[in-house]
Amino acid sequence: APVPPGEDSKDVAAPHRQPLTSSERIDKQIRYILDGISALRKETCNKSNMCESSKEALAENNLNLPKMAEKDGCFQSGFNEETCLVKIITGLLEFEVYLEYLQNRFESSEEQARAVQMSTKVLIQFLQKKAKNLDAITTPDPTTNASLLTKLQAQNQWLQDMTTHLILRSFKEFLQSSLRALRQM
């Protein structure tokens, strides 16, 4: 499993380092999750040829995975801190059902998949503390999520492999874009 935030093995030893600010903690948390995604992607890519597949668009149409767009206020053109923060939190909440789907999809990285899921919950909490306009954040409907989960789990093996690959790739891209935007705040 990856090293938990605050014990990052890549940090240079700094005995007198100041306690992390909330921004640094969020930054570190995202890096930690990205680390976990990387390990999960390794297993996925080793297990199937999905990572090279050009048929992704087929499956992608059936998944409504969160994606950053210019209207979300996270790009430098039209950057809006509050709108962007709402988009990041909403996007992460929408990803939660897909992260739940990933839980039974890994053999050697089962612990890693759980760590990604739990760390994302912690990240959402960090970001909610930072957000001023919590009313603008729409929480996904649990019933809709439950039926989506059932539908995804009922797919054939090939589609399940494709779905796993697409979730990991999209989540990685969403986090990278979020990290970039959060650093501008």
């Epitope: 890096r31 680390d35 950053m68 790009f75 891209e173 986090l175 990278q176 874009s177 501008q184």
Partner: antibody, heavy 124, light 107 residues
Framework: QVKLEESGPGILQPSQTLSLTCSFS??????????VSWIRQPSGKGLEWLAH???????HYNPSLKSRLTISKDTSTNQVFLKITSVDTADTATYFC????????????????WGQGTSVTVSS | DILLTQSPKFLLVSAGDRVTITCKAS??????VSWYQQKPGQSPKLLIY???NRYTGVPDRFTGSGYGTDFTFTISTVQAEDLAVYFC?????????FGSGTKLEIK
């Protein structure tokens, strides 16, 4: 292997618009984590970052020049463009484009490949 | 903007010497600092990324360290071919600023 090549007008007059092209090969700007930056260097001076375009079309500019800069990309032809309006003699420099790529699994970038640069002189 | 203060501006050293260049950021940039080498008439080349990671093919005499606001770049045993200008650069937040450069000259 990765290669980048800048092209520009060489010489232009004050108040004109400078159009630069960065043609690259060996990577795709539709790949997540990829991007291209423009950097300039007046003769004998330091490096000044101008603009960056990410794979997801997010564009970042140097605030001191933002009103004069426009960066764009053509993913199908592997090219990135930079336009600088209302040039002045202070814009005389060598202009570099560089691939700014994601390293490791985090949101950490580095300019790992650079073009040879194209020399631009603004003179009346 | 994040300002990077690089020092010294010039270094005159003999082959075999150890040299250290420092780069101080005006605010925390985590470990998002790269170091570049620019030889006369050439474009810059990446040496170190993520503060301490040596780029592919870079000799191990080049090292980097640091976190937050204070970064160090070291050449353990300077060689004649190390004659160049060295720049630090932060990739934490745009605008992605560069240090002013350190010109290394060999006696």
């Amino acid at each position: 292997q990765v290669k980048l090549e800048e092209s520009g007008p060489g010489i232009l007059q004050p108040s004109q618009t400078l159009s630069l092209t960065c043609s690259f090969s060996g990577f795709s700007l539709s790949t997540s984590g990829m991007g291209v930056s423009w950097i300039r260097q007046p003769s004998g001076k330091g490096l000044e970052w101008l603009a960056h375009i990410y794979w997801d079309d997010d564009k970042h500019y140097n605030p001191s020049l933002k009103s004069r800069l426009t960066i764009s990309k053509d993913t199908s032809t592997n090219q990135v463009f930079l336009k600088i309006t209302s040039v002045d003699t202070a814009d005389t420099a060598t202009y570099f484009c560089a691939r700014r790529s994601l390293y490791g699994n985090w949101g950490d970038y580095a300019m790992d490949y650079w073009g040879q640069g194209t020399s631009v002189t603004v003179s009346s | 903007d994040i300002l990077l203060t690089q020092s010294p501006k010039f270094l005159l050293v003999s082959a075999g010497d150890r040299v250290t260049i420092t780069c101080k950021a005006s605010q925390s940039v985590s470990t998002d600092v790269s170091w570049y080498q620019q030889k006369p008439g050439q474009s810059p080349k990446l040496l170190i990324y993520y503060a301490s990671n040596r780029y592919t093919g870079v000799p191990d005499r080049f090292t980097g360290s640091g976190y937050g606001t204070d970064f160090t770049f070291t050449i353990s045993t300077v060689q004649a071919e190390d004659l160049a200008v060295y720049f630090c650069q932060q990739d934490y937040r745009s605008p992605f600023t560069f240090g002013s450069g350190t010109k290394l000259e060999i006696k």
